[in-house]
């Protein structure tokens, strides 16, 4: 059950409502839990999880990453620049999360939950951002052709792509959570 949809919340009216930051924190951890579950299926199915990070790095995926210039590290920390980077990065990950939708058998619902929870997280963060104009939304046509290209790969490359997306998304979310803790 995604955060905020917990039936226990209804049964406990005395509980303090979550602050915006707590809700975002909880949402990110919920997505991280979903990623873990998906990775278990991926690792059981293929030996991708044994691949070294270096081997995986030699791919042509352009997955979002945190860099010093993004203002998310405490040195040179810039709340608005960082928030824009996090939202933009999550929007860029959406096409990859769409790709994951047909990649799981026993964890199909979990893959959908990760995708939907990410959309909710983006909405939470957009409410927090002051400068929504600075957020660039990926081009739908570009995304559509990327999706077609990824789906046309052979089985081995698709397994590697799945593993790489999940690992990179996890690292991006962890970096985001660390940065959001400073806001």
């Amino acid at each position: 059950v995604p955060p905020g949809e917990d039936s226990k919340d209804v049964a406990a009216p005395h509980r303090q409502p979550l602050t915006s930051s707590e809700r975002i924190d909880k949402q990110i951890r919920y997505i991280l839990d979903g990623i873990s579950a998906l990775r278990k299926e991926t690792c059981n199915k293929s030996n991708m999880c044994e691949s070294s990070k270096e081997a995986l790095a030699e791919n042509n995926l352009n997955l979002p990453k945190m860099a010093e210039k993004d203002g998310c590290f405490q040195s040179g920390f810039n709340e608005e620049t960082c928030l824009v980077k996090i939202i933009t990065g999550l929007l860029e990950f959406e096409v990859y999360l769409e790709y994951l939708q047909n990649r799981f058998e026993s964890s199909e619902e979990q893959a959908r939950a990760v995708q939907m929870s990410t959309k909710v997280l983006i909405q939470f963060l957009q409410k927090k951002a002051k400068n929504l104009d600075a957020i660039t939304t990926p081009d739908p046509t570009t995304n559509a052709s990327l999706l077609t290209k990824l789906q046309a790969q052979n089985q081995w490359l698709q397994d590697m792509t799945t593993h790489l997306i999940l690992r990179s998304f996890k690292e991006f979310l962890q970096s985001s959570l660390r940065a959001l803790r400073q806001m």
Epitope: I35, S36, K53, F73, Q74, S75, L177, R178, Q182
Partner: antibody, heavy 122, light 111 residues
Framework: EVQLQESGPGLVKPSQTLSLTCTVS??????????WSWIRQPPGKGLEWMGV???????YYSPSLKSRTSISWDTSKNQFSLQLSSVTPEDTAVYYC??????????????WGQGTQVTVSS | NFMLTQPPSVSGTLGKTVTISCAGT?????????VSWYQQLPGTAPKLLIH???TRASGIPDRFSGSKSGNTASLTISGLRSEDEANYYC??????????FGGGTQLTVLG
């Protein structure tokens, strides 16, 4: 109560591979957000972080040791292991395994093994 | 290989206060609020004192406190006791899922 116990040979020959295992009791190594590190201490010197394996099995290594280090786990035995290749006498140290209780926003070590002495000598 | 910089030794008098510094860079101490401090007695494993810059670990008395300013972290021990004589190490998260320790500081408690 979580307990960590290092095991492995106390003597390794130069150029060989050092292999150590850390057995964890009192909690699963796959518990969400936990991470498990190897840290070493050469005689009379400070602590050196070597690398970590997190709750998903993802590994990260110290840049200075990256080319020689490999950390893996055996979840069925609740153990994680360190392999350090091409050892030299400079790798002589007490090797500790330790737990980070929250790798997302923690980065500290609340439980440690008692340490195992490894000497590299021919 | 990279290490945080600590003074090799400091001394303090029983009952008084002593501060141990730990200097890093914007990639570790300055970049994150993930500084921890450990006490190591001879022949034993390190013991966690402080994490997240200033949060005391379970069971650690409030004589131990941590702080941070810029790229430097500090551990302050007040009301010094003879059993505080030990080696103290700082550690920090470092960019891209790495960690780094300080070289250690030997604390001597003078009568």
């Amino acid at each position: 109560e979580v307990q960590l116990q290092e095991s492995g040979p106390g003597l390794v020959k130069p150029s060989q591979t050092l292999s150590l295992t850390c057995t964890v009791s009192g909690g699963s190594i796959t518990t969400r957000y936990y991470a498990w590190s190897w840290i070493r201490q050469p005689p009379g010197k400070g602590l050196e972080w070597m690398g970590v394996i997190d709750y998903d099995g993802d590994t990260y290594y110290s840049p200075s040791l990256k080319s020689r280090t490999s950390i893996s786990w055996d979840t069925s035995k609740n153990q994680f292991s360190l392999q350090l290749s091409s050892v030299t006498p400079e790798d002589t140290a007490v090797y500790y395994c330790a737990r980070d209780p929250d790798v997302v926003t923690g980065f500290h070590y609340d439980y440690w093994g008692q340490g195992t002495q490894v000497t590299v000598s021919s | 290989n990279f290490m945080l910089t600590q003074p090799p030794s400091v001394s303090g008098t029983l009952g008084k206060t002593v501060t141990i510094s730990c200097a890093g860079t914007s990639s570790d101490i300055g970049g994150y609020n993930y500084v921890s401090w450990y006490q190591q007695l001879p022949g034993t494993a390190p013991k966690l004192l402080i994490h997240r810059v200033s949060t005391r670990a379970s069971g650690i008395p409030d004589r131990f406190s941590g702080s941070k300013s810029g790229n430097t972290a500090s551990l302050t021990i007040s009301g010094l006791r003879s059993e505080d004589e030990a080696n103290y190490y700082c550690a920090s998260y470092r960019n891209f899922n790495n960690a780094v320790f300080g070289g250690g500081t030997q604390l001597t408690v003078l009568g």
